[in-house]
């Protein structure tokens, strides 16, 4: 058993049927000594009495807000969360696993450059009852600060027959160089706290490896005269690193028929600019990566050939 | 520790090419390691990121472009510094600044060099025979120096008398390509800088 | 005590279907992820499918993936493996297990997969 | 496609120690804990170690596990001719949890 917050204690469970559970022993915050009687949640069962009380902890039945009175007066409150252990390894129900990069991935994380700002997200299909609370450090063993803000419902979605909630915090660390070589990754927790059920993830990265740029920005068309080639023209997106010719991006144009089925054409370059032929119907677009590590792809900045 | 806009140097063209070439190879290199490796913890995720020229060199610093020297984070990220007195930046010379930067790189590069020559010689000795250095990579270390054209008194090749333990020689080579393909991407954004001035 | 009883196993021909059961009792079923384990004659265990305590995610081995259906009822504190399109490769004596460091197995039921 | 691999058979005498080893990777046995269970003819498995190296109350104390790395192993200390079996090592792999992975299975023979 451990302190999660103030009069909050997490009881660690190895889960499966008939298990022996944990002897937990509650104590009453009071100078009090005799009179004391003990209950759970809203019940007026009387579980015992004494200035500690030893329950058994199996089941979410025995967890729950554990009071002390004396004398119709509430003496002090615990409450009792579970974390289950299964199999050792401890349950991931609270969040959808996005399987994306790879399996197994409850928290993602995206910075729009290499501030040492980065924002992550996580999905569920729980809509009550739900609480979040986030951390950062930049190492484990001797953790340099990030400072995260609260976690916050950003979207819901609907998937077949299930609402889906996106959750998600903006971290910044305390102290960044954007030219800096990261040697130590980022490591961000997630405590997450469904009714009585507690369960924690963690994220671990290079700023470097998260990095996804904002689209570019005023995208243009100029005709070039008596050709069927247009003239394409972007600028760096606002939010990323400058200098620009020291974080430099590279870019991808793409020509793309009304069609999905039609024939896409792509150039890559790094310049600013681009020529290519403008189809009747087509889009132009856009989408620019760090031009020397190769992390993600922006979205598509697009505009209509005609 | 900073790099202020400098006329165009005719000479850093070169060195632009070249250092694009070495981030190609480098990453080659380490996606090949990665492949043939799979079974030894290789990745990004699994490996220990040591930095072979911390305390020697002082790259990031010495190269950090003029418009980051305002940012307090990119001045003390290191003990080590070409620069100390930060107020006497406005009256060192454009050139004196850049020299530091590049003989940095210099010695990062023959730093890597010496390692990589001696890693070879032990995979070679692999009765395995599993993975060993990709040529072009070292010729493109070596090409990338003689453009910096910094005289420096050779490094010996380290030698070992001890039987190589080629489980340890293969971890340490994925983790000195990590850290080289790191450097080669700031050597890239110092080379593209430089360029742009 | 835990107790898991199976029942539904038989003999069938290719491409029809089965269902299996798996009744539990002694515990707090719906507290549980269950999974079911075959064992083809003479071979060794291979794990077929899981469910989650409360059905919201499922899980399948890549050869059953499409034909077999894990669900669960847990207000009848019952397992089920609905298989479909059967093949002559699903014939095994097919377990029911508890999710967790120590588990309790079903006596198993013989499916039998032959024209 | 068994990621988990165990020989075959092992045999030994009344009263010798005998070990069966399981060799996996780094995504499953390198990162999860492993199981052993022992299984007689027509009967279903029965758990004899969880979390590498537990014993379940009832399970006779000859029996023992290990983990090391990306492989780990049961020792019988003293076989006795009821333990004439096929074994199984289990574990996770990292990807794809809950998914059980199976050993190959060793059958165990006690001569004499």
């Known amino acids: 058993i451990w302190e999660l917050k103030k009069d909050v204690y997490v009881v660690e469970l190895d889960w499966y049927p008939d298990a022996p559970g944990e002897m937990v022993v509650l104590t009453c915050d009071t100078p009090e000594e005799d009179g004391i009687t003990w209950t759970l949640d809203q019940s007026s069962e009387v579980l015992g009495s004494g200035k500690t009380l030893t329950i058994q902890v199996k089941e979410f039945g025995d967890a729950g807000q554990y009071t002390c009175h004396k004398g119709g007066e509430v003496l002090s409150h615990s409450l009792l969360l579970l974390h289950k252990k299964e199999d050792g390894i401890w349950s991931t129900d609270i969040l959808k696993d996005q399987k994306e990069p790879k399996n197994k991935t409850f928290l993602r994380c995206e910075a729009k450059n290499y501030s040492g700002r980065f924002t992550c997200w996580w999905l569920t299909t729980i809509s009550t009852d739900l609480t979040f609370s986030v951390k950062s450090s930049r190492g484990s063993s001797d953790p340099q600060g990030v400072t995260c803000g609260a976690a916050t419902l950003s979207a819901e979605r609907v998937r077949g027959d299930n609402k889906e909630y996106e959750y998600s915090v903006e971290c910044q660390e305390d102290s960044a160089c954007p030219a800096a070589e990261e040697s130590l990754p980022i490591e961000v927790m997630v405590d997450a706290v469904h009714k009585l059920k507690y369960e924690n993830y963690t994220s671990s990265f290079f700023i470097r490896d998260i990095i996804k740029p904002d689209p570019p920005k005023n995208l243009q068309l100029k005709p070039l005269k008596n050709s069927r080639q247009v003239e394409v023209s972007w600028e760096y997106p606002d939010t990323w690193s400058t200098p620009h010719s020291y974080f430099s991006l590279t870019f991808c144009v793409q020509v793309q028929g009304k069609s999905k089925r039609e024939k896409k054409d792509r150039v890559f370059t790094d310049k600013t600019s681009a020529t290519v032929i403008c189809r009747k119907n087509a889009s132009i677009s856009v989408r620019a990566q760090d031009r020397y590590y190769s992390s993600s792809w922006s979205e598509w900045a697009s505009v209509p050939c005609s | 520790r900073n790099l202020p806009v400098a006329t165009p140097d005719p000479g850093m063209f070169p060195c632009l090419h070249h250092s694009q070439n070495l981030l190609r190879a480098v990453s080659n290199m380490l996606q090949k390691a990665r492949q043939t490796l799979e079974f030894y913890p290789c990745t990004s995720e699994e490996i220990d990121h040591e930095d072979i020229t911390k305390d020697k060199t002082s790259t990031v610093e010495a190269c950090l472009p003029l418009e980051l020297t305002k940012n307090e984070s990119c001045l003390n990220s290191r003990e080590t510094s070409f620069i100390t007195n930060g107020s006497c930046l406005a009256s060192r010379k454009t050139s004196f600044m850049m020299a530091l930067c590049l003989s940095s790189i210099y010695e990062d590069l023959k730093m890597y060099q010496v390692e990589f020559k001696t890693m070879n010689a032990k995979l070679l000795m692999d009765p395995k025979r599993q993975i060993f250095l990709d040529q072009n990579m070292l010729a493109v270390i070596d090409e990338l120096m003689q453009a910096l054209n910094f005289n420096s008194e050779t490094v010996p090749q380290k030698s070992s008398l001890e039987e190589p333990d080629f489980y340890k020689t293969k971890i340490k080579l994925c983790i000195l390509l990590h850290a080289f393909r790191i450097r080669a991407v700031t050597i890239d954004r110092v080379m593209s800088y430089l360029n742009a001035s | 005590q835990v107790q898991l009883v199976q029942s539904g196993g038989g003999v069938v021909q290719p491409g029809r279907s089965l269902r299996l059961s798996c009744a539990a009792s002694?515990?707090?079923?719906?507290?549980?992820?269950m999974h079911w384990v075959r064992q083809a004659p003479g071979k060794g265990l291979e794990w077929v499918a899981f469910?989650?305590?409360?059905?919201?995610?499922?899980y399948y081995a890549d050869s059953v993936k499409g034909r077999f259906t894990i669900s669960r009822d847990n207000s009848k504190n019952t397992l089920y493996l609905q298989m479909k399109s059967l093949r002559a490769e699903d014939t095994a004596v097919y377990y029911c297990k508890t999710h967790g460091s120590h588990d309790n197995w079903g006596q198993g039921t013989m499916v039998t997969v032959s024209s | 496609s068994y990621v988990l691999t165990q020989p075959p058979s092992v045999s030994g005498t009344p009263g010798q120690r005998v070990t069966i080893s399981c060799s996996g990777g780094?995504?499953?046995?390198?990162?999860?804990?492993v199981k052993w269970y022992q299984q007689l003819p027509g009967t279903a498995p029965k758990l004899l170690i969880y979390?590498?190296?537990s014993r379940p109350s009832g399970v006779p104390d000859r029996f023992s596990g290990s983990k090391s790395g990306t492989s780990a192993s049961l020792a019988i200390t003293g076989v006795q001719a009821e333990d004439e079996a096929d074994y199984y090592c289990q574990s996770y792999d990292r990807g794809t949890h809950p998914a059980l992975l199976f050993g190959t299975g060793t059958k165990v023979t006690v001569l004499g």
């Open positions: 979390g590498n190296d």
């Open positions: 002694g515990f707090t079923f719906s507290s549980y992820g």
């Open positions: 780094r995504s499953n046995i390198g990162s999860n804990t």
């Open positions: 469910i989650r305590y409360d059905g919201s995610n499922k």
